[in-house]
Interface confidence: medium
């Protein structure tokens, strides 16, 4: 006699100031009447009231007046809840209560998360380094939730356990700063990594910081930039670092600087006969002027695009020459996938439905992953394509074809294979026969 | 190098707003948070709150909302720090820091706010 | 908030002499995230020691730092006259951070 009432299993995962929607259906009997439901959402531990609907209206939020429920779907058992501008202090079970002739009810949990920041790297002391010194390396990374997980790593991949402390710290949002500190003896050169892991969005943030340390006297003028590609993001500033040591007396007046693109040698900016050239790169490109007399030689590249990508060379003339390549890898990270399944309605088992996963703006050509509920692997009957816009970002479109059994998950998670990004969507299908979506 | 530009005085009225500048050169203005820190004469250091130029995201303490209000501009790389409802309790050193790691390696001047009609 | 005590407020010394100075925190705090600043008259507050016993960029080796969880202590082997400034311990492992009241280093 009770009244069916579904929701997700899995948590509802939500960022941190976005809407989420609550899924929550009953399946009205024919002749049902909004006049015969009385429907209730609440905070499951405390039994707070959060959303109501009775007597034939909505009887509004209780919940800081940020929810609101499907008003023209609440007829065809649609009593999903729509929560607005989530907060960290939302997270929880929420229950929705489905009273009409009969009673049921159901609990559906929310997952809060916020992606934290790429983390900065900062290194004391920072000059005159030798092997053999101890220095301390920091790694921040802020404004994420929940707390993160951190993992150092040596420039072979090996991991660094010992002399690391990290420290996570709520602010009155209740995101997370981190910071992570790791203490290491210098040898002749090495490269430090520091990953910062979000585990419910599953996506890595990292940064590395490659020291050398004091240059060995010879004839060239040594020049210096990071061994590993800088990574940028499109739309953002980046800093394509070059370093130089500059010898007593050096005076800005002897120096030529020149950075080109590495294959077609096309110029990009200049310093020569005491004083900045300017860009010859689309007036995006800078140095920093007031860095050059210690020998910081950086370019820094304004409002990256896709087109940027690729080798600069860093050119430094003094009396003697030297000359480096850093690679500037460019990335998008892919939004969250939207999942729509056709056909959509009055589906039953045996039934061949289509599920296609769309994922957008992203670069560089992301990794298409489709599994089960269970994790298995879906690899037959899918097909996935990539569609580069004028800027050259990609949208992904993935397609799998499935026979539905009684029930079943299907997940689909695109991977930025340059940011170690993953952005999943997953769509259950229950009951039979049923329709989807269950939500706006 | 570091440097941290900041005008040398405001004299305000009593129950006046001011906002103080505070000018970032020498490193990646958007990378990394500014602080604010007061100084009343003869006293100790107290942390207002910080502002992550980049996000916009900012961490006060508890004792200075609605005191303070933290802003950016990214085109100058330029923090600010707009101080109301001045009384006497307010006039102080202001300084602003920028840690690059949990440290404040870099001080601004600071500016001396007096408060007086 | 996590407070922390520092004490002496102030401290009369001869050049020459060994001073201690400590920081005591409310609540444990890691060492890594425990820092000092100088600060002299009339000029804003210096970068010293970072995490607990690290001396900043060009601070004097008769500088030192010790501690861990809630006992800090920053100690000079030999006062020299341009020692002479306040002192401020800070910690930066929960929100709000907080500083010292500071220790006033004198010199006779």
């Known amino acids: 006699g009770a009244l069916e009432v579904q929701v997700p299993e899995d948590p509802v995962v939500a960022l941190v100031g976005t809407d989420a929607t609550l899924c929550c259906s009953f399946s009205p009997e024919p002749g049902f009447s909004l006049a015969q439901l009385n429907l209730i959402w609440q905070l499951t531990d405390t039994k707070q009231l959060v959303h109501s609907f009775a007597e034939g209206q909505d009887q509004g939020s209780a919940y800081a007046n940020r929810t609101a429920l499907f008003p023209d779907l609440l007829a065809q058992g649609n009593a999903s809840l729509r929560l607005q501008r989530v907060r960290v202090a939302d997270e929880g079970s929420f229950t929705c209560f489905v009273s009409i002739r009969d009673f049921g009810s159901a609990a559906v949990s929310l997952q809060v998360a916020a992606p934290y920041s790429k983390p900065s790297m900062t290194l004391e002391p920072n000059k005159d380094l030798r092997p053999g010194d101890t220095v301390t390396i920091t790694c921040s990374s802020y404004q994420g939730y929940p707390e993160a997980e951190v993992f150092w790593q040596d420039g072979q991949g090996v991991p660094l356990t010992g002399n690391v402390t990290t420290s996570q710290m709520a602010n009155e949002q209740g995101l997370f700063d981190v910071h992570s500190i790791l203490r290491v003896v210098l040898g002749a050169n090495g490269t430090y990594s520091c990953l910062v892991r979000n585990p419910v969005l599953q996506q890595d943030a990292h940064s590395s910081v490659t020291i050398t340390p004091q240059r060995s006297p010879t004839g060239a003028v040594e020049v210096q930039v990071p061994e590993d590609p800088v990574v940028a993001l499109v739309g953002t500033d980046a800093t394509l670092r070059c370093s130089f040591s500059p010898e007593p007396g050096f005076s800005l007046a002897q120096l030529n600087l020149i950075w080109q693109l590495t294959d077609t040698k096309q110029l990009v900016h200049s310093f020569t006969e005491g004083r900045d050239q300017g860009s010859a790169y689309a007036n995006r490109t800078a140095l920093f002027p007031d860095l050059l007399a210690q020998g910081n030689a950086s370019l820094r590249l304004q409002r990256v695009r896709v087109a940027d990508e690729g080798s600069f060379t860093c050119f430094v003339s003094i009396r003697d020459f030297g000359s480096a390549a850093v690679s500037l890898q460019v990335a998008a990270p892919y939004s969250k996938p939207s999942m729509t399944l056709e056909p959509n309605k009055d589906l039953r088992p045996g039934d061949t439905v289509t599920i296609t996963c769309s994922s957008y703006r992203g670069y560089p050509e992301a990794e298409v992953f489709w599994q089960d509920g269970q994790g298995v692997p879906l690899t037959g009957n899918v097909t996935t394509s990539q569609m580069a816009n004028e800027q050259g970002l990609f949208d992904v479109h993935s397609v799998l074809r499935v026979v539905l059994g009684a029930n079943g998950t299907y997940s689909c998670l695109v991977r930025n294979p340059v940011l170690q990004q993953d952005a999943h969507g997953s769509v259950t299908i229950t009951g039979q026969p049923m329709t989807f979506p269950p939500e706006a | 190098q570091v440097q941290l530009q900041q005008p040398g005085a405001e004299l305000v009225k009593p129950g006046a707003s001011v906002k103080l500048s505070c000018k970032a050169s020498g490193y990646t203005f958007t990378s990394y948070w500014m602080h604010w820190v007061k100084q009343r004469p003869g006293q100790g250091l107290e942390w207002i709150g910080m502002i992550h130029p980049n996000s916009g995201g900012t961490n006060y303490n508890e004792k200075f909302k609605g005191k303070g209000t933290l802003t950016v501009d990214k085109s100058s790389s330029t923090a600010y720090m707009q101080l109301s409802s001045l009384t006497s309790d307010d006039s102080a050193v202001y300084y602003c820091?920028?840690?690059?790691?949990?440290?404040?390696?870099?001080w601004g001047q600071g500016t001396l706010v007096t408060v007086s009609a | 908030e996590n407070v922390l005590t520092q004490s002496p407020a102030i401290m009369s010394v001869s050049p020459g002499e060994k001073v201690t100075m400590t920081c005591r925190a409310s609540?444990?705090?890691?060492?890594?995230?425990l820092h000092w600043y100088q600060q002299k008259s009339g000029a804003s507050p210096k970068f010293w020691i970072y995490?607990?016993?690290n001396l900043a960029s060009g601070v004097p080796a008769r500088f030192s730092g010790s501690g861990s969880g809630t006992s800090y202590s920053l100690t000079i082997s030999s006062v020299e006259a341009e020692d002479a400034a306040t002192y401020y311990c800070?910690?930066?492992?929960?929100?709000?951070?907080?500083f010292g009241a500071g220790t006033k280093l004198e010199l006779r």
């Open positions: 800070q910690h930066y492992s929960g929100y709000p951070l907080t």
């Open positions: 820091v920028t840690s690059q790691a949990t440290w404040f390696a870099y």
């Open positions: 995490s607990t016993s």
């Open positions: 609540s444990s705090v890691s060492s890594s995230y």
